[in-house]
């Protein structure tokens, strides 16, 4: 029950996170004009990953796309790439996790397969979240660098009395959406990974084992101790030892040819 809840919650949290990453990627307000000591401006600029916009004091807004690939800063391209990778991985993770949900029955899919898929989707969510957080952080760092650079050159003299005022940009709403969304996707991914452990069949849940002395030398099969990750081929609680180790309530069987060295 707790496993189902953890898995379900992980899925929902990741879903919200990925929706947020998509929203942040599409938003125009990655950077907004710094209003410093001027709260009302005649022209207000803000920029996204795909276009830049201008809002005039009348409320009229005009946006222009970045219709060039080669002319854009490498950092912006990197941020775009990180966000897209995050969305793609997240979308695939969501698709995988839907089939992995314990509450959904698909044919005769065994628990180990579901555990496998849960872990896979969890890892995908973690990477997706990290991509989003990295993308937003790279952009934020770029803004901070440019902000202080433009503050240093706030007013550059141009031939006597003529001046140009550099527009300074600060963090836009999309950055905060991206950070929160990336964090949620990451948390969702961790929850999926935790749920995976509970979904994996218990393979080391043995009854009391009695060792019977036998005349022949007994060799334990290699790979006897398998970690219970759910990735093994043992899907049922089958015996791992075929040698002299026998459970007390088992009928003693004759040694097989595999038992001899």
């Amino acid at each position: 029950m707790a496993v189902t809840a953890c898995q379900g919650l992980g899925f929902v949290v990741s879903l919200i996170g990925i929706a947020g990453i998509i929203a942040a990627t599409c938003m125009d307000q990655w950077s907004t004009q710094d209003l410093y000591n001027n709260p009302v401006t005649a022209v207000f600029n803000y920029q996204g990953l795909w276009r830049s916009c201008v809002r005039e004091s009348s409320g009229f807004t005009e946006c222009r796309g970045y219709f060039t690939l080669l002319g854009l800063p490498a950092m912006l391209q990197a941020v775009r790439a990180l966000m897209i990778v995050g969305i793609v991985l997240g979308a695939i993770g969501l698709l995988v996790s839907i089939f992995a949900l314990k509450c959904i029955r698909i044919g005769s899919m065994e628990d180990s397969a579901k555990a496998n898929m849960t872990l896979t989707s969890g890892i995908m969510f973690i990477v997706s979240g990290l991509c989003a957080i990295a993308g937003v952080s790279v952009f934020a760092n770029m803004l901070v660098t440019n902000f202080w650079m433009s503050t240093a050159n706030m007013y550059t003299g141009m031939g006597g009395m003529v001046q140009t005022v550099q527009t300074r940009y600060t963090f836009g709403a999309a950055l905060f959406v991206g950070w929160v969304a990336g964090g949620l996707t990451l948390i969702g991914g961790v929850m999926m990974c935790i749920a995976c452990r509970g979904l994996a069949p218990e393979e080391t849940n043995y009854k009391a084992v009695s060792y019977h002395a036998s005349g022949h030398s007994v060799a334990y099969k290699p790979g006897g101790f398998k970690a219970s990750t759910g990735f093994g081929s043992n899907t049922k609680n089958k015996k791992i030892y075929d040698g002299g180790a026998r459970t007390e309530d088992e009928v003693q069987s004759y040694p097989s040819k595999h038992d001899y060295v």
């Epitope: 001027n38 005649a42 022209v43 830049s52 004091s57 009348s58 009229f60 222009r64 003529v162």
Partner: antibody
Framework: QVQLKESGPGLVAPSQSLSITCTIS????????VHWVRQPPGKGLEWLVV???????VYNSSLKSRLSLTKDNSKSQLLLKMNSLQTDDTAIYYC????????????WGQGTSVTVSS | DIVMTQSPSSLTVTAGEKVTMTCKSS????????????LTWYQRKPGQPPKLLIY???TRESGVPDRFTGSGSGTYFTLTVSSVQAEDLAVYYC?????????FGSGTKLEKK
């Protein structure tokens, strides 16, 4: 059609305050901003204040302490108040509509003449 | 505040003549976000309120004759009347529309020769 009409006292004594009303028709104060501009005799245009459609008001920094602008949506009116008038405040006072784009003033009232004299 | 400087202060013209007046701003009025210059031109005839001619430095207001042309970018702008008509005799003002407070130039008076 779009119309703006200013109405004021005409004559004001020095150090007194001035109240001018701009009555608008053909548009809403919730959709368009309204500017106040004046022109002293023999001089150029001087921008005074704007009330934007979102309710934000921006004043000319040199006159900010003496100006106040309020709007009455129900009457479609804007009231400009100016304190401590001096003779150099003698001018024609205009209200003008803020254009939907371009940050320009597209429709103007005929103006009201204000003379500051004792 | 932005200082707008217009020159010349007056121009004497004859009908049909081409005239150009200039306007300089103390700061750039160009906005890189939408690639527009926030400069406006107005015409004011005696006893009348100002009339909007050109906004965004070069966009004519509807109803304005195409003999009026605005140009320029950054800090330097011009208004050209390709063939002056009698009804064009007026004072022309440029206005900063980029920064509050909006500021006007001192005007260029177009007079008959």
């Amino acid at each position: 059609q779009v119309q703006l009409k200013e109405s004021g006292p005409g004559l004001v004594a020095p150090s007194q305050s001035l109240s001018i009303t701009c009555t608008i028709s053909g548009f809403s104060l919730n959709t368009y901003g309204v500017h106040w501009v004046r022109q002293p005799p023999g001089k150029g245009l001087e921008w005074l204040v704007v009330m934007l459609s979102d309710g934000n008001t921006v004043y000319n920094s040199s006159l900010k302490s003496r100006l106040s602008l309020t709007k009455d949506n129900s009457k479609s009116q804007l009231l400009l108040k100016m304190n401590s008038l001096q003779t150099d405040d003698t001018a024609i006072y205009y209200c003008a509509r803020h254009k939907a784009y371009g940050n320009a003033m597209d429709y103007w009232g005929q103006g009201t003449s204000v003379t500051v004299s004792s | 505040d932005i200082v707008m400087t217009q020159s010349p202060s007056s121009l004497t013209v004859t009908a049909g003549e081409k005239v150009t007046m200039t306007c300089k701003s103390s700061q750039s009025l160009f906005n890189s976000g939408n690639q527009r210059n926030y400069l406006t031109w107005y015409q004011r005839k005696p006893g009348q309120p100002p009339k909007l001619l050109i906004y965004w430095a070069s966009t004519r207001e509807s109803g304005v004759p195409d003999r009026f042309t605005g140009s320029g970018s950054g800090t330097y702008f011009t208004l050209t009347v390709s063939s002056v008509q009698a009804e064009d005799l007026a004072v022309y003002y440029c206005q900063n529309a980029y920064y509050f407070p909006f500021t006007f130039g001192s005007g260029t008076k177009l007079e008959k020769k």
